[in-house]
């Protein structure tokens, strides 16, 4: 019995179906086929879970969180024992193993390993201003998404006709910050932050209002 090499890893957007491949060759009839799919979740590597089981001509559910979402892609028994997972969740990310036994065929490699990564587009980022908006002050524009896998990068731009940040601004696309030093009236206006990763983008708008000093009455 020999389980075929599988692609190292599969990426899928959250909510979409994933197919985890596993095929094998055998010299025996498929009368005593026994297939166990296991997962070692990324979120809990010490706690492997059973995903689905085929034994004695019957299918059995694995861990409760997979109930109703998992099945074999083809009619069993077969030499293609790939499975699908519907409505993938972040917690489905992990290393999946198919363990195949088909007595009396023993020996050879009977395990196939596939990694699954569930990708999440950036959630709507939160835009905010840190610091005084008085003229001459330094401000930081903050942008962060609570969700996003891979981790989003953040691009700030000022919505004027240059689409460029003020000349006194420095941007950190990893942290999602823009520091604008010595703000002036020309720093005022509408800014857009775009959070993006491999599978999506999300934006927020922020309004910077630089406050000019009020003339003081003397007397």
């Amino acid at each position: 019995l020999e389980v075929s090499e599988s692609p190292g890893s599969i990426q899928v957007a959250r909510g979409q179906p994933a197919v985890l491949p596993c095929t094998f060759t055998t010299s025996a009839a498929l009368i005593n086929l026994n297939v166990i799919w296991m997962v070692t979740p990324l979120s809990n590597a010490n706690q492997p879970e059973q995903v689905i089981l085929y034994q004695g001509g019957q299918m059995f559910d694995g861990a409760p969180r997979f109930h109703g979402r998992v099945g074999f892609t083809g009619t069993m028994p077969a030499t293609n024992v790939s499975i699908f997972i519907n409505n993938t969740q972040l917690s489905d990310t992990g290393t999946y193993q198919c363990l195949v036994n088909n007595l009396p065929d023993i020996g050879g490699r009977n395990i196939g390993v596939t990694g699954l990564t569930v990708l999440v587009p950036p959630s709507a980022p939160h835009c905010q201003i840190q610091g005084s908006q008085d003229i001459g002050s330094d401000v930081i524009l903050l942008c962060s998404s609570e969700e996003g896998i891979p981790r989003p990068t953040y691009l700030w731009e000022k919505l004027d006709n240059t689409l460029k940040l003020p000349p006194t601004a420095t941007q950190d696309q990893v942290q999602g910050t823009v520091t604008i030093r010595n703000i002036s009236a020309l720093s005022s206006g509408l800014y857009q932050c775009v959070a993006s990763n491999a599978i999506g983008t999300s934006t927020c708008l922020l309004d910077l209002q630089v406050i000019s000093p009020q003339p003081r009455n003397i007397g």
């Epitope: 709507a124 919505l159 004027d160 006709n161 689409l163 009236a185 020309l186 005022s188 206006g189 509408l190 857009q192 775009v194 999506g200 983008t201 999300s202 934006t203 708008l205 309004d207 209002q209 630089v210 406050i211």
Partner: antibody, heavy 121, light 110 residues
Framework: EVQLLESGPGLVKPSQTLSLTCTVS??????????WSWIRQHPGKGLEWIGY???????YYNPSLKSRVTISVDTSKNQFSLKLSSVTAADTAVYYC?????????????WGQGTLVTVSS | QPGLTQPPSMSYGLGQTATLTCTGN????????AAWLQQHQGHPPKLLSY???NGPSGISERLSASRSGNTASLTISGLQPEDEADYYC???????????FGGGTKLTVL
């Protein structure tokens, strides 16, 4: 209550420049936080955003019209203006001035009555 | 060509509930939500709701806005003759970097 009122010629010849002014009353353009915009509506059709100006003079135009648009502000008169160059019959529309702000998620909460501009020789 | 798609016309009976739809993409409605505007013949548009179901003061409680994915909806219950108007949706498009509008839906109250 903020009010906006458009004014300008109702007829412009092709290839000339369309010029409109919006006068704001009941609020100051200089108060900040507001994006003073021009939006147009072709006869019997939908709306098209042209561009905005901030009280500081910072402008931002619809990329599809950018090459022909100029918006300016006169805070002393509480007015902002639109110039659209090289007009053709396709620029015939009702032109509205409008205001957007943070409080309405940058959507347009106050509109002028609109002025019909016809491009014809 | 409008950036958002709306059915050109819809008809409902007096007192019925109308649901108007507006379809965009992930860069506009899917990202930012949508605003709804009402326009009576010969009048400027009036903002009804923004960012899905927020609304300016003084707007009828018979109106409700929502979003599902890239589609925004406006529901008007207990239709009155004064609800007969054109309805436009609008959204900020982060890719075009512009406010975009739908082509409008003419609502007729029978």
């Amino acid at each position: 209550e903020v009010q906006l009122l458009e004014s300008g010629p109702g007829l412009v010849k092709p290839s000339q420049t369309l010029s409109l002014t919006c006068t704001v009353s009941g609020g100051s353009i200089s108060s900040g936080g507001y994006y003073w915009s021009w939006i147009r509506q072709h006869p019997g059709k939908g709306l098209e955003w042209i561009g905005y100006i901030y009280y500081s003079g910072s402008t931002y135009y619809n990329p599809s019209l950018k090459s022909r648009v100029t918006i300016s502000v006169d805070t002393s008169k509480n007015q902002f203006s639109l110039k659209l160059s090289s007009v053709t019959a396709a620029d015939t529309a009702v032109y509205y001035c409008a205001r957007a702000s943070r409080s309405t998620d940058y959507y347009f909460d106050y509109w002028g009555q609109g002025t019909l501009v016809t491009v014809s020789s | 060509q409008p950036g958002l798609t709306q059915p050109p016309s819809m008809s409902y009976g007096l007192g019925q509930t109308a649901t108007l739809t507006c379809t965009g993409n992930r860069n506009n409605i899917g990202d930012q939500g949508a605003a709804w505007l009402q326009q009576h013949q010969g009048h400027p548009p009036k903002l009804l709701s923004y960012r899905n179901n927020n609304g300016p003061s003084g707007i009828s409680e018979r109106l409700s806005a929502s979003r599902s994915g890239n589609t925004a909806s406006l529901t008007i219950s207990g239709l009155q003759p004064e609800d007969e108007a054109d309805y436009y949706c609008s959204a900020w498009d982060s890719s075009l970097r512009a406010w975009v509008f739908g082509g409008g839906t003419k609502l007729t109250v029978l």
